[in-house]
Interface confidence: low
């Protein structure tokens, strides 16, 4: 009986990488391409249809366009090899290779796609009022991860993690975690993105710097407060000048009334 074989029935590949899945079929002497049919499908998605010595791209599901191909040179070696480039999370699933060459047979191969939280971006900012540091780690990956914060002396710290969908790919998760802590210069902290499965952890090291620039949000506050403080300065200067010229009482009464009217009405009436 015509039987096809697979050397691997499970392939695990990283998001964005390439994979070549193989089905082997018996070839005696010279391969007759025109007697061979090869199909690669994933559930109801048609990926490859090789019939009458050529690949029919009209059949190919749009999600595999420009990314999936049958390696023709391998056919002569008795291998129906499907190559997928720029692997996406949606490519994960069960693939079927069906080969007809006199007899016919098929095999199923599972493709698993994972995306490690490898590129961890980090930020450290400080609250100028409380001097509390805010440490932030952000990364994209799949499946969902929890973020563990630890100090250099291995204490586990309590951070706040938010998970959203990535802008890059629908199934990809964007995980952001923040830790608010009172820290001193050169202290070291670690954020670890932990996914299910062995060796699925990715860690970033955050070192508290000697001096921190004012965070962007604080700079914005100064931009808004700046003109107001300037105006206040002008008002105080005018008040001081008028006081010197003996017209102090009218202005003072006016100002006192305005400044206190909201909070201390009783004073307003006493002074009037």
């Amino acid at each position: 009986a015509f039987t096809i074989t697979v050397s691997k029935d499970l392939y695990v590949v990283e998001y964005g990488g390439n994979v070549t899945m193989e089905c082997k079929f018996p070839v005696e002497k010279q391969l007759n391409l025109f007697a061979l049919i090869v199909y690669w499908e994933m559930e109801d998605k048609k990926i490859i249809q090789f019939v009458n010595g050529k690949e029919d791209l009209k059949v190919q599901h749009s999600s595999y366009s420009q990314r999936a191909q049958l390696l023709k040179d391998q056919l002569f070696l008795g291998k129906a090899a499907l190559q997928i480039t720029d692997v996406r999370l949606q490519d994960a699933g069960v693939y079927c290779c069906l080969i007809g060459y006199g007899g016919a047979d098929y095999k199923r191969i599972t493709l698993k796609v994972h995306a490690p939280y490898r590129n961890i971006s980090q930020r450290i900012s400080v609250d100028p009022v409380t001097s509390e540091h805010e440490l932030m780690c952000q990364a994209e990956g799949y499946p969902e991860a929890e973020v563990i914060w630890t100090s250099s002396d291995h204490r586990v710290l309590s951070g706040k993690t938010t998970i959203t969908n990535s802008n890059r790919e629908e199934k990809l998760f964007n995980v952001t975690s923040t830790l608010n802590i009172n820290a001193t210069a050169n202290e070291i902290f670690y954020c670890t993105f932990q996914r299910s499965g062995p060796e699925e952890n990715n860690t970033a090291e955050l070192v508290i710097p000697e001096r921190l620039p004012v965070p962007a949000s604080e700079r914005t506050h100064f931009m808004i407060l700046g003109p107001f403080l300037l105006l206040l300065g002008v008002v105080l200067a005018v008040t001081f000048c008028l006081k010197k010229h003996g017209r102090m009482m009218d202005v003072e009464k006016c100002c006192t009334r305005d400044r206190n009217s909201k909070k201390r009405n009783d004073i307003q009436f006493e002074e009037t």
Partner: antibody
């Protein structure tokens, strides 16, 4: 060896629903789709629907409104439910494994003979 | 839906001779160059059993005396030489378009 065993009632009252469980062995529901086909003397063989390995379903448009197919991969079971049965739904109901790229049915279940009668 | 018409409805053949069953589709079952037509054998009290898929591909384990041919809308199943064990009903099935549909069946008997 690959097997599909079916369990379900033999007699259903008109306007009631039919539930059949297809318990599989020798393969995984995460790798193969499972189709449902029925056979009656009056209408012959009719394809009803499929649940794909990934869990999504496709139904014959003639049955969409009253058919649902679900599964439990861990228990290796597929659940078939058809509502509002009438006398002309009397048939043998089969679950069958989707072969190759799910064009055909390479292994069939034992079959459940269903009679709709009061 | 695609309607499949099988002929003849019944067929009596002598042992060792050739049996030919036809199946005609109401429209093409071609799927980008491949005819998605299958053939099944069914014996009394048993579910159907797959013999041929994609018009001419014999399923692994099926005896070589079974063969399929045809394309587009016209297909045939050939059994040669016919054996006693081949007494059964034979059905064609298309999957070129959803829903999958079946022929009405051909009953094979021995003369």
């Amino acid at each position: 060896q690959v097997q599909l065993k079916q369990s379900g009632p033999g007699l259903v009252q008109p306007s009631q629903s039919l539930s059949i469980t297809c318990t599989i062995s020798g393969f995984s529901l995460t790798s193969f789709g499972v189709h449902w086909v029925r056979q009656s003397p009056g209408k012959g063989l009719e394809w009803l629907g499929v649940i794909w390995s990934g869990g999504s379903t496709d139904y014959n448009a003639a049955f969409t409104s009253r058919l649902s197919i679900n599964k439990d991969n861990s228990k290796s079971q597929v659940f078939f439910k058809m509502n509002s049965l009438q006398a002309d739904d009397t048939a043998i109901y089969y679950c069958a494994r989707g072969g190759g790229p799910d064009w055909y049915f390479d292994v069939w279940g034992t079959g459940t003979t269903v009679t709709v009668s009061s | 839906d695609i309607v499949l018409t099988q002929s003849p409805a019944s067929l009596a053949v002598s042992l060792g001779q050739r049996a030919t069953i036809s199946c005609r589709a109401s429209e093409s079952v071609e799927y980008y160059g491949t005819s998605l037509m299958q053939w099944y054998q069914q014996k009394p009290g048993q579910p159907p059993k797959l013999l041929i898929f994609a018009a001419s591909n014999v399923k692994s384990g099926v005896p070589a005396r079974f063969s399929g041919s045809g394309s587009g809308t016209d297909f045939s199943l050939n059994i040669h030489p016919v054996e006693e064990d081949d007494i059964a009903m034979y059905f064609c099935q298309q999957s070129g378009k959803v829903p999958h549909t079946f022929g009405g069946g051909t009953k094979l008997e021995i003369k």
